[in-house]
């Protein structure tokens, strides 16, 4: 069955997953589709990478991590009910029926109303509506240009922390993680 | 210490081709990326294209497709790149130069000098 | 291609100030962006890349962050030997492309 991340509407979406490159010059090709990983490629591709570059992308997907170490994270941004579905990352692996597939469910909630976020400086206050859990809970993100006044040194700060400790050890743990060489 | 020496400057005729030089020490050649980039006089940097030693691939701008083509020559350690057709468009600086972290281009060549006149 | 918009293209300042060089690029490039500097006659110098990790051996004056599409570059306390051409670079997508450049001078 597909892991399942849950996302607001108007917020941006974030369908992890990640593979280990065997070496930096060898990047292994990437495809995220909507719809279930069929027996080859993606469907309906709305991202594509390549040995090197993300090679094609659609109005609105991109992928903020950093995909030349493995971190081929899906973002999709200002998301409406109509992204609701399963969306399939497939890793390219050279070979016969090597490649790895991933099914990741994503479930668009209404938007709610809240109050402006407080002045704290913990990762709450930074990213109000950024929830996280291990396992196959729910991931929520909202876009950089709606957060609270902090500087950019600070925002380039708390985005590295939260990417490096909690956030990628609770994706890596929801499965979508292969290891390549 | 790492180094991309490039070969020296050229003076070639309209339509001619060229072909200039990027010789690369200090470093395991086939584990990095050359890329190569355009300078016209006063003006900014144009990405041409790369080639990655350790397997011969090639990616270009399409905008130097048919005008640039990039090649390699493990043996020695040196990296080319052959410009076709010149006119006075071409006339420019060419940069080779190393992508190293986070795929930056961290070494570059001391540049060559390409001057297409009659 | 992806355009990244780089401004100022001329900066005229005097040796302690703080300057800030911005680009814009068109569309998301996430931290794919380095900031090259080119002094007269010499070959561009890699300064900071992935958007806000300072190259090895540049000095710390230098810094570099992301907010969004929008990237900037910034020299704490400008020193003369900062006489150059500035310029940011995204290879998220190829054709890697660069802004403009910004030329800093010196009062």
């Known amino acids: 069955s597909e892991v399942e991340y849950r996302a607001e509407v108007g917020q941006n979406a974030y369908l992890p997953c990640f593979y280990t490159p065997a070496a930096p010059g060898n990047l292994v090709p990437v495809c995220w589709g909507k719809g279930a990983c069929p027996v080859f490629e993606c469907g309906n591709v709305v991202l594509r990478t390549d040995e090197r570059d993300v090679n094609y992308w659609t109005s609105r997907y991109w992928l903020n991590g950093d995909f030349r170490k493995g971190d081929v994270s899906l973002t999709i941004e200002n998301v409406t009910l109509a992204d609701s579905g399963i969306y399939c990352c497939r890793i390219q692996i050279p070979g016969i029926m090597n490649d790895e597939k991933f099914n990741l469910k994503l479930v668009i909630k209404p938007a709610k109303v809240t109050p402006a976020p407080t002045r704290q400086r913990d990762f709450t206050a930074a990213f109000p509506r950024m929830l996280t859990t291990r396992g196959h809970g729910p991931a929520e993100t909202q876009t950089l240009g709606s957060l609270p006044d902090i500087n950019l040194t600070q925002i380039s700060t708390l985005a590295n922390e939260l990417r490096d400790s909690r956030l990628a050890n609770d994706l890596r743990d929801s499965g979508a993680t292969i290891r390549i060489g | 210490q790492i180094q991309l020496q490039q070969s020296g400057p050229e003076l070639v005729k309209p339509g001619a081709s060229v072909k200039i030089s990027c010789k690369a020490s200090g470093y395991t050649f086939t584990d990095y990326y050359i890329n190569w980039v355009k300078q016209r006089p006063g003006q900014g940097l144009e990405w041409i294209g790369w080639i990655y030693p350790g397997s011969d691939n090639t990616k270009y701008n399409e905008k130097f497709k048919g005008k640039s083509t990039l090649t390699v020559d493990t043996s020695s350690s040196t990296a080319y790149m052959q410009l076709s057709s010149l006119t006075s468009e071409d006339s420019a600086v060419y940069f080779c130069a190393r992508s190293g972290n986070y795929y930056a281009m961290d070494y570059w060549g001391q540049g060559t000098s390409v001057t297409v006149s009659s | 291609s992806i355009v990244m918009t780089q401004t100022p293209k001329f900066l005229l300042v005097s040796p302690g100030d703080r300057v800030t060089i911005t680009c814009r690029a068109s569309?998301?490039?996430?931290?794919?962006v380095a900031w090259y500097q080119q002094r007269p006659g010499q070959s561009p110098k890699l300064l900071i890349y992935?958007?806000?990790n300072r190259y090895t051996g540049v000095p710390d004056r230098f810094t570099g962050s992301r907010y969004g599409t929008d990237f900037s570059f910034t020299i704490s306390t400008v020193q003369a030997e900062d006489l150059a051409v500035y310029f940011c670079q995204q290879d998220y997508s190829s054709p890697y492309t660069f802004g403009g450049g910004t030329k800093l001078e010196i009062k």
């Open positions: 992935y958007a806000s």
């Open positions: 569309q998301s490039v996430s931290n794919n």
